[in-house]
């Protein structure tokens, strides 16, 4: 579908006759009759099979024609077709004289023909006109002429048919040709899938309009390519929505449960070794030198007591040194040249002859140890107790004293207020709003009943010379522990002096 | 052959929601060429197109109805789905489910579900 | 086009050609379809784009459209023919507007 236009620019009729020669009265008043037909190698007269026009008197014997496309549409002419354009054409103008108003060819005389033209050729799709002049014995037609095609037909025939759009179902313009050219942000055969944001997920992601990245469910992230994990999920990844796939050291339904206490929150001090026992429990393994729960005090050798029989210790650079009282010998003073007659072995420790009675062997009692049974048994330097519990000499045995939230022998269960039993000697347990509290029966004291109140058999001070002062639990006797410098079973006894045993 | 099922309450009260699902049967909803569309006709009234979905979940409602209309799409089922908020007698009609997209025309409907009668009434 | 405007109704002996018509403000501009209900039954696609039968459509089915108004146009019409038929067009706000349906009578 498209359009012939055609514009009448000049017609020259100097002497203003007709084509038979007679002049007009007063003048010729000219107007046009068009035919548009298809090619004809000799155009000959028939059907207008492409269309005809006429013109109303558009001037007389010479004269320009004005463009008048603004007012009416008379000049350029219109022959619209309805119809694939050929590419060629034949065109017959003809010139005519009108002495009345009335323009019909029945209301016509024969001889008021002024002139006619007859042209034929090739003519392409185009907005350029085709500029041409005829000129016959009297007259000379100056005009031009175009084919364009109709509104929403396009392409070298016009037979595209294409109309541009912007809604929903679909955003172009159309091209020269025909097709649809996609406005900026949209794709798809009619234009109507939004581009999304560059790099959204194909599957996880979609927009409703171009430079968007709306997630579908389970997913997030400007560009929807970060699953979401299972809601509550606190030390956890997922590769799929909804999962919760525990960091390393944590476990759970949540990864709430902190299997790795000593990574996340590396408790052992000093360059102690820490061991894993458990959701949020640990062990710490001192270096030499160290100690406590998480091997934050610093130990001197001295202090684990390695003399015995009462002699005094002395920390050095590389170790310690043993001052052993008369009657002992050896690196921890653990060799004795008394006899069974010199009543070596202390509390309540029973005297065996050895090798003739040149030498003894003391068989002590539950929670005394040493040659002389002068040490009271420690059964907490190997740090049995677990989630930082405080080890305690109880008699012949030991004790875990538990931190909150934890229970059991070597506080490895978690248990929670009063369920962890924490009151100690049969203490009766009160669940508090913050806590709890205990109430101890007679004879013990402290928050968890774990202090015994029975008589103390050092709170006389028997022990002289500043030496360190252990009670028997059992017997509710004393055991001194020397300093450099003193022996003797209070210390009383300086190096060198000999003792007068009062036994 | 595509074809088209709609399946719904048959009688809503006023002011509650109609619930409505569309199920495509001999081919797949998610077809890039093809749209899904909802119309609706009152008895003895004309058509009036509702809205449509594409699969990937983009949607496109009447202004007119654009406040109380939503759809959905779910690929797993098949289907796609309307709900219309806070109906009144106006909203009686036979709803049909259509494809959209003949000759590549995103806005052609080819081919209908046989309609589904829905009564607003107390 | 916001509104598409048919007559209600056309009467045509079988055999007669029907023309059943739709206009809108600048209706040409955009792409029409018609549909044929028949009572009872769900609409059916005869004319896309204007001028276009969806295979399975007889030939005595054309469409037209250019300026204001679109046309159908029922050549040698059938009993069979008689039904409700509905255009179809877009605007800028409206992504589908059907025209109001003319219930065509063949006598």
């Known amino acids: 579908s498209g359009v012939f236009q055609l514009q009448l620019q000049e017609f020259i009729n100097e002497r203003g006759v007709l084509a038979s020669g007679r002049p007009c009265e007063p003048g010729c008043r000219t107007f046009f009759r068009v035919c548009l037909k298809h090619f004809q190698a000799v155009v000959s007269p028939g059907p207008c099979t492409f269309g005809t026009v006429s013109t109303p008197v558009l001037g007389t014997n010479s004269f320009a024609v004005r463009d008048d496309s603004s007012g009416g549409g008379r000049n350029p002419l219109q022959l619209p077709f309805n119809f694939t354009w050929p590419g060629t054409f034949s065109l017959i103008i003809e010139a005519w004289h009108a002495p009345g108003d009335d323009l019909r060819p029945e209301a016509l005389p024969p001889d008021a023909l002024i002139s006619k033209i007859a042209i034929q050729g090739s003519l392409a799709v185009g907005q350029n006109w085709l500029l041409d002049e005829q000129t016959s014995t009297l007259t000379r037609l100056r005009y031009s002429y175009r084919v364009i095609c109709s509104d929403n037909y396009y392409g070298d025939n016009c037979s595209r048919l294409c109309k541009k759009r912007n809604d929903h179902f679909g955003h172009y313009v159309c091209q020269p040709d025909g097709n649809l050219s996609c406005l900026p942000g949209w794709t798809g055969e009619y234009c109507q899938q939004p581009i999304c944001l560059s790099g959204c997920h194909e599957q996880n992601g979609y927009c409703s309009k171009p430079a968007e990245c709306l997630c579908r469910p389970g997913w997030q992230g400007r560009l929807c390519n970060e699953c979401i994990p299972h809601n509550g999920c606190r030390h956890g990844t997922c590769s799929t929505p909804w999962q919760c796939t525990c960091d390393e050291g944590w476990g759970g339904l949540f990864c709430d449960q902190d299997l790795n206490y000593c990574t996340h929150h590396s408790p052992c001090k000093n360059g102690a070794t820490c061991s894993n026992s458990g959701q949020r429990s640990y062990t710490c393994t001192c270096r030499p030198g160290y100690t406590g729960v998480d091997c934050e005090l610093e130990l001197s050798e001295c202090d684990s007591n390695p003399c015995r029989n009462g002699g005094s210790c002395k920390d050095q650079e590389d170790g310690y040194h043993c001052l052993c009282p008369p009657g002992y010998y050896g690196l921890h003073c653990e060799h004795s040249t008394l006899s069974c007659a010199d009543s070596p072995c202390f509390n309540g420790g029973s005297c065996r002859e050895r090798n003739q009675g040149a030498n003894y062997a003391c068989e002590c009692p539950p929670n005394f140890t040493g040659s002389n049974c002068e040490k009271k048994v420690d059964r907490c330097t190997s740090n049995p107790c677990a989630n930082g519990g405080q080890c305690l000499n109880r008699g012949p045995s030991r004790m875990c004293r538990c931190r909150p939230g934890f229970t059991g022998t070597y506080c490895e269960l978690h248990v929670s207020d009063c369920a962890r039993n924490p009151c100690a000697h049969g203490g009766t347990c009160h669940d508090l709003e913050n806590g709890l509290m205990c109430t101890c029966p007679a004879g013990f004291s402290g928050r968890r009943c774990e202090v015994r109140t029975s008589i103390d058999a050092c709170a006389s001070s028997p022990c002289f010379n500043r030496a360190t002062c252990y009670t028997d639990l059992s017997t509710d006797t004393f055991v001194c522990n020397c300093p450099y410098g003193f022996v003797g079973s209070r210390c009383e006894f300086p190096v060198g002096l000999p003792p007068s045993f009062p036994w | 052959q595509l074809q088209l099922q709609e399946s719904g309450p048959g009688l809503v009260k006023p002011s509650e929601t109609l619930s409505l699902s569309c199920t495509v049967s001999g081919g797949s909803i998610s077809s890039s060429s093809s749209y899904w569309g909802l119309i609706r006709q009152p008895p003895g009234k004309g058509l009036e197109w509702i809205?449509?979905?594409?699969?990937?979940?983009?949607?496109y409602y009447s202004p007119s109805l654009k406040s109380r209309v939503s759809i959905s799409v779910d690929t797993s089922k098949n289907q796609f789905s309307l709900k219309l908020s806070s109906v009144t007698a106006a909203d009686t009609a036979v709803y049909f489910c259509?494809?959209?997209?003949?000759?590549?025309?995103?806005?052609?409907?080819?081919?209908w579900g046989q309609g589904t009668m829905v009564t607003v009434s107390s | 086009s916001s509104e598409l405007t048919q007559s209600p109704s056309v009467s045509v002996s079988p055999g007669q050609t029907a023309r059943i018509t739709c206009s809108g403000d600048k209706l040409g501009d955009v792409y029409v379809r018609w549909y044929q209900q028949k009572t009872g039954q769900s609409p059916v696609l005869v004319i896309y784009e204007d001028t276009k039968r969806p295979s399975g459509i007889p030939e005595r089915f054309s469409g037209s459209n250019s300026g204001n108004t679109a046309t159908l146009t029922i050549s040698g019409t059938q009993v069979m023919d008689e039904a409700d038929y509905y255009c179809?067009?877009?605007?800028?706000?409206?992504?589908?507007?059907f025209g109001g349906g003319t219930k065509l009578t063949v006598l």
């Open positions: 809205g449509s979905i594409y699969y990937s979940g983009s949607t």
């Open positions: 179809q067009a877009w605007d800028s706000t409206t992504a589908v507007i």
């Open positions: 259509a494809r959209q997209g003949y000759g590549g025309h995103p806005d052609v409907f080819d081919i």
